[in-house]
């Protein structure tokens, strides 16, 4: 595993194939779970920040941004979105988490939450996925949509299996993050697959 | 096999420094964080800092932040830990531990390295 | 930083008995706690982690469960190789810290 701080993957450009594998050995459905990463794009349109697909299912868990100042996170197919006023192009800090007891979801942009929304109650997120950042993926690791893939800059790329309480998603986005257990910046284990470059991160 | 080798035992001088080795082999030592931990005779594991040995990356227990130093050498694959201003109460058997694949638990342990402080 | 309590800070037991060690959180550590094994001039050796999860090559007699600030280390027949000092640790936060042991003695 490599660790990342200080550094960002950048998809330089719209494309069908670029993208970057995450490995995570998760064994257990989630309950539970924190996603935080920054990500700097100039992209008006629709894309995919961060797919997470299981065997046979599409969307399991899913990170979009339907158009600027609108989150979408799906969690079993299913959707909910929120919004923010927010600057266009500009460096973002994006955090969201979810409860499976309360079906509650949550985002944080750049420290600030946004409305409480809930989907999936008592659902629990399947274990084995398979993680991709700069596509979306519409089965298990592939059948990618070039108009909904990412042109950016993604970094300080951080999952745990737990809900983080307010302060530690501050100090995630002031740059001192948990030890994260299920996908860690820090200790990041990963394949670039096409034309992604491993960069400095400049913009924070 | 996966080891790690640490250097002999010291005795040293209160006030003065003294510099840990820990030898790796049997994986790539630059893809896993380094830690340090340490055990006063007797008592329990306390832990110092960690050191990623490809981008040097460290983090620190506040405790030891002023007088700990994390290094590696890629070369030799070789992790060391500097502890400086040494007191009686830093008496203690100092290991390096690997960081496990995917989790922040320590699943490779050095032998051990025995520091005697004492005038 | 999280304090890491263990009970009872040591025990006497028989070999084939069935051991519980507590390691209480001062604050919620989620599941991110590992157990360690340490034998006198040892060093430790990885048990469990992720509270739960037995390490590749120990003994399925050795089981460890809980989240949040309570988890248990449980050995379920005692072999006379078991007789040592065990250490949880968290590493949901840092500093990582670790309980004080429970030095496990033949009875």
């Known amino acids: 595993h490599t660790d990342l701080s200080g550094k960002v993957f950048v998809f330089p450009r719209e494309s069908v194939t670029d993208h970057v594998n995450l490995i995570t050995p998760l064994e257990k459905p989630l309950q539970n779970f924190t996603l935080c990463f920054r990500a700097y794009s100039d992209l008006s349109r629709a894309y995919s920040l961060f797919s997470y697909n299981t065997q046979g299912r599409d969307n399991e868990l899913l990170v979009y941004k339907e158009r600027v100042g609108e989150y979408s996170l799906y969690i079993g197919r299913h959707k909910v979105t929120s919004k923010v006023i927010e600057k266009f192009p500009a460096p973002v800090h994006i955090c969201v988490s979810w409860e499976s007891s309360s079906g509650i979801a949550e985002f944080w942009i750049n420290g600030t939450p946004l409305v409480k929304k809930g989907l999936r109650q008592g659902y629990f997120v399947e274990a084995q996925p398979k993680i991709v950042l700069g596509q979306e993926q519409d089965s298990y690791g592939g059948k990618f949509d070039r108009s909904q893939s990412f042109v950016g800059e993604i970094g300080d790329l951080y999952m745990w299996d737990s809900v983080l309480p307010p302060e530690n998603i501050l100090s995630a986005y002031q740059g001192t993050p948990l030890p994260a257990n299920i996908l860690d910046w820090q200790a990041l284990n990963y394949e670039i697959r096409g034309y992604v470059i491993i960069k400095p991160l400049v913009w924070v | 096999q996966v080891q790690l080798v640490q250097s002999g035992a010291e005795v040293k001088k209160p006030g003065s420094s003294v510099k840990v080795s820990c030898k790796a082999s049997g994986y790539t030592f630059t893809s896993y964080w380094m830690h340090w931990v340490r055990q006063a005779p007797g008592q329990g594991l306390e832990w110092i800092g960690m050191i990623h040995p490809n981008s040097v990356n460290t983090n620190y227990n506040e405790k030891f932040k002023s007088r700990a130093t994390l290094t590696v050498d890629k070369s030799t694959s070789t992790a060391y830990m500097e502890l400086s201003s040494l007191r009686s109460e830093d008496t203690a058997v100092y290991y390096c531990a690997r960081r496990n694949d995917y989790y922040w638990y320590f699943d490779v342990w050095g032998q051990g390295t025995l520091v005697t402080v004492s005038s | 930083d999280i304090q890491m309590t263990q009970s009872p800070s040591s025990l006497s037991a028989s070999v084939g008995d069935r051991v519980t060690i507590t390691c209480k959180a001062s604050?919620?550590?989620?599941?991110?706690v590992a157990w360690y094994q340490q034998k006198p001039g040892k060093a430790p050796k990885l048990l469990i982690y992720s509270a739960s999860y037995r390490y590749s090559g120990v003994p399925s007699r050795f089981s460890g469960s809980g989240s949040g600030t309570d988890f248990t280390l449980t050995i379920s027949s005692l072999q006379p190789e078991d007789f040592a000092t065990y250490y949880c640790q968290q590493c949901n936060n840092y500093p990582f810290t670790f309980g004080q042991g429970t030095k496990l003695e033949i009875k």
């Open positions: 604050q919620n550590v989620n599941s991110n």
